[in-house]
Amino acid sequence: DSEEDEEHTIITDTELPPLKLMHSFCAFKADDGPCKAIMKRFFFNIFTRQCEEFIYGGCEGNQNRFESLEECKKMCTRDNANRIIKTTLQQEKPDFCFLEEDPGICRGYITRYFYNNQTKQCERFKYGGCLGNMNNFETLEECKNICEDGPNGFQVDNYGTQLNAVNNSLTPQSTKVPSLFEFHGPSWCLTPADRGLCRANENRFYYNSVIGKCRPFKYSGCGGNENNFTSKQECLRACKKGFIQRISKGGLIKTKRKRKKQRVKIAYEEIFVKNM
């Protein structure tokens, strides 16, 4: 497959962003434990991003083990949690705003912000540097814009779109009008490659937003950031996505990117989409 072909892959809504899980234990490897029973169980596979069957020995193991496929999906897949595009009028919070803070399983602590549904405000927490969930923001402002209510009970702002003049990429931007057209790419695609804190040399890929391509780098094995993919295809799929267009009933339409310049009409504004 050429990069051109990969770029035109249409991603389904249920696809997980890389290294962003609803619970850290969903990233654990299937562990049959030391006992010798033969019990059919399910675990979440972070590489296929699906719940799969495995044989459990009956004792010990880890939390990435579920009695049923449904329970596994409920705990570890994001069918609902990643549908951040809501109907225009409702302006609801994204579902991930209601997830509890999750520092993840690494220990390269950095200050991040999450929306605390108990206090109805964004708060600081220590993020371990990997995994965790999407209720995780680099700045207080970003957290407030996405998850906090304004004084009238509505969102402070809702996602919008801006064409970045520097690198021709679309980045989320707060808009005062309900936008019908949005970029659904994860914000971490715009972060630089980060080797992390350990001493391994694993082959990984990161999205270079300046040149708009996925490039290899050596990962240390822990820490770093979410712009970290095990394959080039996974990197392209996550960071070079198409747009998502709202329709009145909250449904989603995926549109592929075109190479030639294309004008997109929006209810409140016009933007140009160029060779992304």
């Epitope: 509890e100 108990q118 206090t119 109805k120 405000q121 600081r124 927490f125 220590k126």
Partner: antibody, heavy 116, light 108 residues
Framework: QVQLVESGGGLVQPGGSLRLSCAAS???????ASWVRQAPGKGLEWVSG????????HYADSVKGRFTISRDNSKNTLYLQMNSLRAEDTAVYYC??????????WGQGTLVTVSS | DIELTQPPSVSVAPGQTARISCSGD??????AHWYQQKPGQAPVLVIY???NRPSGIPERFSGSNSGNTATLTISGTQAEDEADYYC???????????FGGGTKLTVL
């Protein structure tokens, strides 16, 4: 200068009520605020907290259902209504600002004694 | 909620380094703060967010936090540092604020 001044403490019988006030001066008191108490010769204990606009309140299990925290931002004042008081509520009560979930400004404290 | 454990007392000679520990389950994954309280006075924040010093707090006060233990270090301890010291942390899940039991620092 930035300061918090508590008032309203005193002697009260078990089962009685008391209302503490905390007046802020030198700054706009619109951030999270809290009450912390200290029994004689003991350590600090967080009692209750309230958001800047008063819409969210939180309580330690030991006072839940008996104490009510509130604020009047137009008067720059924080309150603690204490009902059904018990001997173990005897303490110095401090009000404190905790904008980033650490207490950076404290009052001088007001003593509440619950005794018959 | 997390429980924070401190030694009841620590003694140090003037000019020496005093270290006060505060332990709690995975405390390193939370922000730890330290307060100084002298007899008859309100507490004063001396370290916030593990290792940051508020303005007006002398440089001899420092803090660290990793694993299960946060540590307040006072280098070149002076007589005026004699006080009770409390560690604390905030638990977002229950929106509660937890204090350690306090450590009495005696400057010999």
């Amino acid at each position: 200068q930035v300061q918090l001044v508590e008032s309203g403490g005193g002697l009260v019988q078990p089962g009685g009520s008391l209302r503490l006030s905390c007046a802020a001066s030198g700054f706009t008191f619109s951030s999270y605020a809290s009450w912390v108490r200290q029994a004689p010769g003991k350590g600090l204990e967080w009692v209750s907290g309230i958001s800047g606009d008063g819409s969210n309140t939180h309580y330690a299990d030991s006072v839940k259902g008996r104490f009510t925290i509130s604020r009047d931002n137009s008067k720059n004042t924080l309150y603690l209504q204490m009902n059904s008081l018990r001997a173990e509520d005897t303490a110095v009560y401090y009000c404190a600002r905790y904008d980033n979930f650490y207490f950076d400004v404290w009052g001088q404290g007001t003593l509440v004694t619950v005794s018959s | 909620d997390i429980e924070l454990t401190q030694p009841p007392s620590v003694s140090v000679a003037p000019g020496q380094t005093a270290r006060i520990s505060c332990s709690g389950d995975s405390l390193g994954s939370k922000f730890a703060h330290w307060y100084q309280q002298k007899p008859g006075q309100a507490p004063v924040l001396v370290i916030y967010d593990d290792s940051n010093r508020p303005s007006g707090i002398p440089e001899r006060f420092s803090g660290s936090n990793s694993g299960n233990t946060a540590t307040l270090t006072i280098s070149g301890t002076q007589a005026e540092d004699e006080a009770d010291y409390y560690c604390s942390t905030y638990t977002s899940r229950s929106h509660s604020y937890v204090f350690g039991g306090g450590t009495k620092l005696t400057v010999l």
